[in-house]
Amino acid sequence: MMTGTIETTGNISAKKGGSVILQCHLSSTMAQVTQVNWEQHDHSLLAIRNAELGWHIYPAFKDRVAPGPGLGLTLQSLTMNDTGEYFCTYHTYPDGTYRGRIFLEVLESSVAEHSARFQIP
């Protein structure tokens, strides 16, 4: 039975040219996390974090994506095209798969604030 819940940074905004941390947290379960996938809006993989093999940032994103903190992902040099949904998928044993969603809005405004509150989707 899947007892866990995924908490995410929810809806966040950040300014163009800046950076943002995408963060998901799995709680309320003792399941072992074996892999975390980070996907962007079209479901292409930004990165994989394998518990044994470590991080792999896919080549298309390696210049602008950094692993961490933790199981999260840092997007750098943001462009307007980065606006959209991002998904974290936690592969766990024995529970199975948990999935979280984050919506990132990239703003032109220089006064855009990066709101990073945790919320349960």
């Epitope: 892999q35 044994e52 080549p59 994103f61």
Partner: antibody, heavy 120, light 107 residues
Framework: QVQLQESGPGLVKPSQTLSLTCTVS??????????WSWIRQHPGKGLEWIGY???????YYNPSLRSRVTMSVDTSKNQFSLMLSSVTAADTAVYYC????????????WGQGTPVTVSS | DIQMTQSPSSLSASVGDRVTITCRSS??????LNWYQQKPGRAPKLLIH???SLQSGVPSRFSGSGSGTDFTLTISSLQPEDFASYCC?????????FGGGTKVEIK
């Protein structure tokens, strides 16, 4: 030298679930650094990557197929499997399994393929 | 998805000929390009990865070049066992995608 061998029914009825197994010999499916992929080739067409799985269960599926695909691993039998649900004639293809280098998806060792026809 | 286009789709050549196959991607993929050989009823075989790195055990008559969007597989002196189909694959982003293949036939 690692060898891979696909097996499963060659004929599946429309709307049913296609189920294939890949048996790995000459090496352990649990050896680090490798994922295990399924690829298919429609008659007269190019190859299409379906997805991959790690021996501990982590997966990634092609977004175009992910709603119908499930992959699993049986380390005790040194096998990994593909299930494709709600098949149609468009799923008629030769299905291959392949060892896959972690991260950058390089398919460095393949099975010889098994043909699957979807027909009533 | 990144589209991979190969040309020609087929070619006829003789033993000893120099054969060149091209692969073009719909966007830049740096050097994340792999080449495979396919024979009917046989397991496909990785020939070249990262555009130009020869896979272990592959004869040196095979070579790859290119970066960005344009890539080439060259067989310097075609041997009888080289009559087969060849396809390219990008591993720059997911999902990985393949070219339509080039069939090398005996003239």
């Amino acid at each position: 030298q690692v060898q891979l061998q696909e097996s499963g029914p060659g004929l599946v009825k429309p709307s049913q679930t296609l189920s294939l197994t890949c048996t790995v010999s000459g090496g352990s499916i649990s050896s680090g650094g490798y994922y295990w992929s399924w690829i298919r080739q429609h008659p007269g067409k190019g190859l299409e990557w379906i997805g991959y799985i790690y021996y501990r269960g982590g997966t990634y599926y092609n977004p175009s197929l992910r709603s119908r695909v499930t992959m699993s691993v049986d380390t005790s039998k040194n096998q990994f499997s593909l299930m494709l649900s709600s098949v149609t004639a468009a799923d008629t293809a030769v299905y291959y399994c392949a060892r896959t280098i972690f991260g950058v998806i390089i398919l460095d060792n393949w099975g010889q393929g098994t043909p699957v026809t979807v027909s009533s | 998805d990144i589209q991979m286009t190969q040309s020609p789709s087929s070619l006829s050549a003789s033993v000893g000929d120099r054969v060149t196959i091209t692969c073009r991607s719909s966007q830049s993929i740096s050097s994340y390009l792999n080449w495979y050989q396919q024979k009917p009823g046989r397991a496909p075989k990785l020939l070249i990865h990262a555009a130009s790195s020869l896979q272990s055990g592959v004869p040196s008559r095979f070579s790859g070049s290119g970066s960005g969007t344009d890539f080439t597989l060259t067989i310097s002196s075609l041997q009888p066992e080289d009559f087969a189909s060849y396809c390219c694959q990008q591993s720059y982003t997911t999902p990985p995608t393949f070219g339509g293949g080039t069939k090398v036939e005996i003239k």
